[in-house]
Interface confidence: low
Amino acid sequence: SAPGEDEECGRVRDFVAKLANNTHQHVFDDLRGSVSLSWVGDSTGVILVLTTFHVPLVIMTFGQSKLYRSEDYGKNFKDITDLINNTFIRTEFGMAIGPENSGKVVLTAEVSGGSRGGRIFRSSDFAKNFVQTDLPFHPLTQMMYSPQNSDYLLALSTENGLWVSKNFGGKWEEIHKAVCLAKWGSDNTIFFTTYANGSCKADLGALELWRTSDLGKSFKTIGVKIYSFGLGGRFLFASVMADKDTTRRIHVSTDQGDTWSMAQLPSVGQEQFYSILAANDDMVFMHVDEPGDTGFGTIFTSDDRGIVYSKSLDRHLYTTTGGETDFTNVTSLRGVYITSVLSEDNSIQTMITFDQGGRWTHLRKPENSECDATAKNKNECSLHIHASYSISQKLNVPMAPLSEPNAVGIVIAHGSVGDAISVMVPDVYISDDGGYSWTKMLEGPHYYTILDSGGIIVAIEHSSRPINVIKFSTDEGQCWQTYTFTRDPIYFTGLASEPGARSMNISIWGFTESFLTSQWVSYTIDFKDILERNCEEKDYTIWLAHSTDPEDYEDGCILGYKEAFLRLRKSSVCQNGRDYVVTKQPSICLCSLEDFLCDFGYYRPENDSKCVEQPELKGHDLEFCLYGREEHLTTNGYRKIPGDKCQGGVNPVREVKDLKKKCTSNFLSPEKQNSKSNSVPIILAIVGLMLVTVVAGVLIVKKYVCGGRFLVHRYSVLQQHAEANGVDGVDALDTASHTNKSGYHDDSDEDLL
């Protein structure tokens, strides 16, 4: 029988009446066009909906926007278009919502061609009131809030000027011209690249990287010959052109660009790219594209300084620059990532790591599923997950994998069961243990969302026909009940619930079509009466994460510690509530060799946890490039995995000695602060002075092991045995350029621009 249809299901009684009393319809009084929706603040209940309808005419675009506001999680909406003077809002800039609970909103208006600058509407009271402000420039990008101070905004203009506001968009100042890319760093620091000659494209690889820590009063040039840069966790990355050819290398800084080290990664050519797949304060997952148009590359994981890298996964699927990758951080369990590899026969297979990239394996076949036609052996196959790549290929996959940090262990995804991803219609699968085991949850493709920290899962069938039924489960997808939310089916366009999965409200968006007109409509359903009571202590059970062998004393140890969570029992139908906090008890593990990655110059043979010296480096002094100086390494081959908290047990010795030799080739790090007026002469002078140093630097780098394509296989191959290798919350990337991506964030050295 289909999942959830058996007699064991604990069904919610009288749910139809309970849901009917909590279903709220809102019909939007305008033509269909497009709709965008944003939550303003956390747990405020405030939603802004912007509908736009535009007709492109020969000379200009005629358009109309309407702005609606709800303060009860979408149950009721009020038309507030008059607050923005009925102005046409540019949808490509979206609604710029301020960080945390600042209550700030910026809408960017469409203005007629002849105007001096653009226009924005600003609110700092959760969109109750808006102030119109005319800009002294035409914005090229959405306004970017400083993560530390929501009054500080930056924007790029169509003329490539970098503009900053210190009073939430009231006054603007152009702090620099000829800017290609700008990003907020920590402590209200701004990083940006500039071009000297023609344009961003023309100067690619000859850009300069600048930093200002005082909102444009003073500047420091922290790099030249820049192709692009990216921020991830506490790391600042720059891809830098080599002196002699068209290759480029990654340099990394952990002090905001004051000092740089050359990452021990292969260099890439013009047609290749680097991409930061994930990063936090401990480490980085870096994708390095393979030469040629292969559609794949290699994932490397970094040490705690972002300098020494270990090969993590070969043949990682990543199509073209800025293309698609399935790399997904499973946020519901520490250390878990899912991605796809391109096998030798060009089929796509899903791989999962439970230890932050130490070892990758196939996903276990769901118990309640048969192997499909892609399987050679009908009894042995794996689950393969559909993510961004499948969606880009227009397979029947409406959603990427879903996990939430506060719904511990739950992962929901479309997939197929066989030897590779199938083009057949997928089903929906769920894991309740962070990806170790899977169960088929729903037949066929669905939209799905998690409510009340996992207490409720909601799904809607993906169909080309109008729909009027929603499914919900109160037991992590084991049993499902259906509710008809309207008599008149609608063309469904999306499920919307407040980010963070704490809400008990779900909004079903769609449109109705009649002979002459079509209108936007939303149905908001509140599940609070389904979960009638608050959860108590008896509703929770203790669950040891990453537990695979209960008889093993070290069971559950990942990255040097194990975590026991209090989790809601599947049989409990109660509210976790908006204030629910995940209860976990961490416990330190004793160190074993699995808590260490192989140090520079060492590698792990397959199926062995010991690190052995690389034959080609035996007897050589181990030297590598750190903070622009040659370092001598005394090691017995091990380095603690970033973020590993183990104590006691095995404790390999390691020592690094500064050789006082400069080795950062072709990278400029002037110590001098540049003021606005004198920056160019100083840079030119330094560049001149540096030419000699650069040549010397190249020779040193060539002599030692600080660079060069031949180094690829010198990084520790950790696929087999690093058992304790996970990190928390790796979603710390600057994702401004990836608003269209779902399910992963990446910062590629090309599509940053």
Epitope: P550, E554, G556, Q585, I588
Partner: antibody, heavy 129, light 107 residues
């Protein structure tokens, strides 16, 4: 050899507090948890709580919650157990015991349990007015 | 919390005879169970861990068995030094709990 040496006997008045120390030697202090167990005269063993010497995190039995505080000093490899608001029924011998537990009393220590393999000699605490 | 019940409370056995002590858990503790021996005026001493593994230095006459909720400590041939109180203890779920003890006395 591995040993746990506890502080000497104490006589306290009701309402007072007592702080018992337990000094570990012969092994890496941070590699094992430490449990405290007490035994009233003529009675059985009663587990009070556990401390993880690495971070100092603790877990106490419900009965002692709010009255017991377990701390550690890694520089001297010593753990301490302080019991406040003493009453006559707290008269007992208090033991520290090395406990290799993986999950400190938070649950499912669902893996091989090695038992409290090394015990202190015990500290007699008498509560009397 | 998990309640551990030991039986009998007192066991009278002659030296050289076999002694069988029982320990029952109110819910499954898997094999996360230990047995201790305590003599008057002394601290407890670990005998068995993991339900069935003898601790270092414990004579072979002591053996443990069981899993889940039912456990047994067997002393195959009682020696004079074995007359003491024996406690079982679970470490499956916090708080750790001990049984009430079984006193093995000379018959």
């Amino acid at each position: 050899q591995v040993q746990l040496v506890q502080s000497g006997a104490e006589v306290k008045k009701p309402g007072a507090s007592v702080k018992v120390s337990c000094k570990a030697s012969g092994y890496t202090f941070t590699s094992r948890y430490m449990s405290w167990v007490r035994q009233a005269p003529g009675q059985g063993l009663e587990w009070m709580g556990i401390i993880n010497p690495v971070g100092g995190s603790t877990s106490y039995a419900q009965k002692f919650q709010g009255r017991v505080t377990m701390t550690r000093d890694t520089s001297t490899s010593t753990v301490y157990m302080e019991l406040s608001s003493l009453r006559s029924e707290d008269t007992a011998v208090y033991y520290c015991a090395r406990d290799p537990s993986g999950i400190a009393a938070a649950g499912p220590a669902s893996r091989y349990y090695y038992g409290m393999d090394v015990w202190g000699q015990g500290t007699t605490v008498t509560v009397s007015s | 919390e998990i309640v551990m019940t030991q039986s009998p409370a007192t066991l009278s056995v002659s030296p050289g005879e076999r002694a069988t002590l029982s320990c029952r858990a109110s819910q499954s503790v898997s094999s996360n169970l230990a047995w201790y021996q305590q003599k008057p005026g002394q601290a407890p001493r670990l005998l068995i861990y993991g339900a069935s593994t003898r601790a270092t230095g414990i004579p072979a006459r002591f053996s443990g068995s069981g899993s889940g909720t039912e456990f047994t400590l067997t002393i195959s041939s009682l020696q004079s030094e074995d007359f003491a109180v024996y406690y079982c203890q679970q470490a499956r779920l916090g708080p750790w709990t001990f049984g009430g003890g079984t006193k093995v006395e000379i018959k």
